[in-house]
């Protein structure tokens, strides 16, 4: 008889395709937005009309396409309306504020900037850490790493002195250089002098 | 005793220059951060610059009122802080002092002042 | 930048009389909080520095408290060179701020 021979060795289907030997002869079965013998053309799939609704543009993609929405429409065939704030676009516990028919202004929580409320503020370049301290940037605050020998929030606190620490915030602990940052979460564990 | 002894104010034309000088003594200059507070005459204190200590490489801040006009500097083989004040605008008029931030988060040693007045 | 509001702006109290100021931020400070008295001609003389902590050499009848964005300079028995114009300053962080001062005055 014939010898078989396996005829995907050679890797032909193209674009993620799957190939299949049949008779010594492959066979690809494509992925979508993609055709040819060897799944090596990509569909425009621009060519066929309706896909972007409301007069959208439609933009040919590899192996898929974009809507690009005209002002007041949304969604992936731009078959929504745009409406500024719903969903609100604004992250890290942003206010979404409408200000026109499609335009929209996040006011955003201490800390962070940016339109979309995006960019957590540095912190550091105003960081008033005391006696050697190391800023790292938290979030509308900072906190500082502190030498062995110094301790609290802005290691105003020597640890020598024991639990001495300024009024409600920390308590003086013996901590390694590399662990002794003290975080803002840590305050509602601290007890009023 | 910790000392802070300012110098170098007096009387300069609006867009002049003045630099004013703090000699310390009594600690270790280079582990504390400095700064230069002002006081106009009948107000309150205003904070103009700071310099942070050697571990913290010595870094700088300004109010925004003398941002790119005044700069501050130090020189520790001199114990010395220094205010360099350019541009000099009639609101600058004011006393300023030089003061030791003690790692306490506040300013427990202040010079005695040096009058800085721009008039035409 | 943090604002300091300190009030009153002045008082008018006699020998003995106890005497507060208060000073707000417009945002947690945590404790960085110090005091001056400054006398007229003189430079500023920290008193109270963390809110609460005295200096060395303060006389006791000087104590501070707070915390966040309310905290309070109190005098418990005013003496004759207590009289004075006393200033709030917040050292969380730059740029540092003072409050607008309060002016101790004789009755």
């Known amino acids: 008889g014939s010898q078989w021979t396996d005829a995907c060795l050679s890797h032909p289907c193209a674009n993620g395709s799957t190939c299949t030997t049949v008779a010594n002869q492959f066979s690809c079965k494509c992925l979508t937005g993609f055709t040819g013998q060897k799944c090596e053309t990509d569909v425009n799939e621009c060519d066929i009309p309706g896909h972007c609704q409301h007069g959208g543009t439609c933009l040919n993609l590899p192996g898929s396409y974009q809507c690009q929405c005209l002002q007041g429409f949304t969604g992936q065939y731009c078959d929504s309306l745009y409406v500024p704030c719903a969903p609100s676009p604004c992250v890290n516990g942003g206010t979404c504020r409408q200000t026109g028919d499609f335009t929209f202004e996040c006011n955003c929580l201490p800390g962070f900037e940016g339109s979309t409320c995006e960019r957590n503020i540095d912190d550091c370049p105003n960081h008033r850490c005391q006696n050697g301290g190391v800023c790292v940037d938290g979030v509308n605050t900072y906190n500082c790493r502190c030498p062995p020998q110094w301790t609290g929030q802005f290691c105003t606190e020597d640890v020598d002195e024991g639990n001495s620490g300024l009024n409600d915030i920390f308590e003086a602990q013996k901590i390694e250089w590399h662990e002794n940052l003290y975080f803002q979460g840590h305050h509602h564990h601290h007890h009023h002098h | 005793e910790v000392q802070l002894v300012e110098s170098g104010g007096g009387l300069v034309q609006p867009g002049g220059s003045l630099k004013l000088s703090c000699a310390v003594s009594g600690f270790t200059f280079s582990d504390f951060y400095m700064e230069w507070v002002r006081q106009a005459s009948g107000k309150g204190l205003e904070w103009v610059a700071a310099?942070?200590?050697?571990?913290?490489?010595?870094?700088?801040v300004y109010s925004a009122s003398v941002k790119d006009r005044f700069t501050i500097s130090r020189d520790d083989s001199k114990s010395t802080l220094y205010l360099q004040m350019n541009s000099l605008k009639t609101e600058d008029t004011a006393v300023y002092y030089c003061?030791?931030?003690?790692?306490?988060?506040?300013?427990?040693?202040w010079g005695q002042g040096t009058l800085v007045t721009v008039s035409s | 930048d943090i604002q300091m509001t300190q009030s009153p702006s002045s008082v008018s109290a006699s020998v003995g009389d106890r005497v507060t100021i208060t000073c707000q931020t417009s945002e947690d400070i945590y404790s960085g909080l110090a005091w001056y008295q400054q006398k007229p001609g003189k430079s500023p003389k920290l008193l109270i520095y963390g809110a609460s902590r005295l200096q060395d050499g303060v006389p006791s009848r000087f104590s501070g408290s707070g915390s966040g964005t309310d905290y309070t300079l109190t005098i418990s028995s005013l003496q004759p060179e207590d009289f004075a114009t006393y200033y709030c300053?917040?050292?969380?962080?730059?740029?540092?701020?003072f409050g607008g001062g309060t002016k101790v005055e004789i009755k």
């Open positions: 310099q942070r200590n050697k571990a913290n490489d010595f870094s700088i």
């Open positions: 300053q917040q050292g969380f962080k730059y740029p540092l701020t």
């Open positions: 003061s030791r931030d003690g790692g306490k988060l506040a300013l427990d040693a």
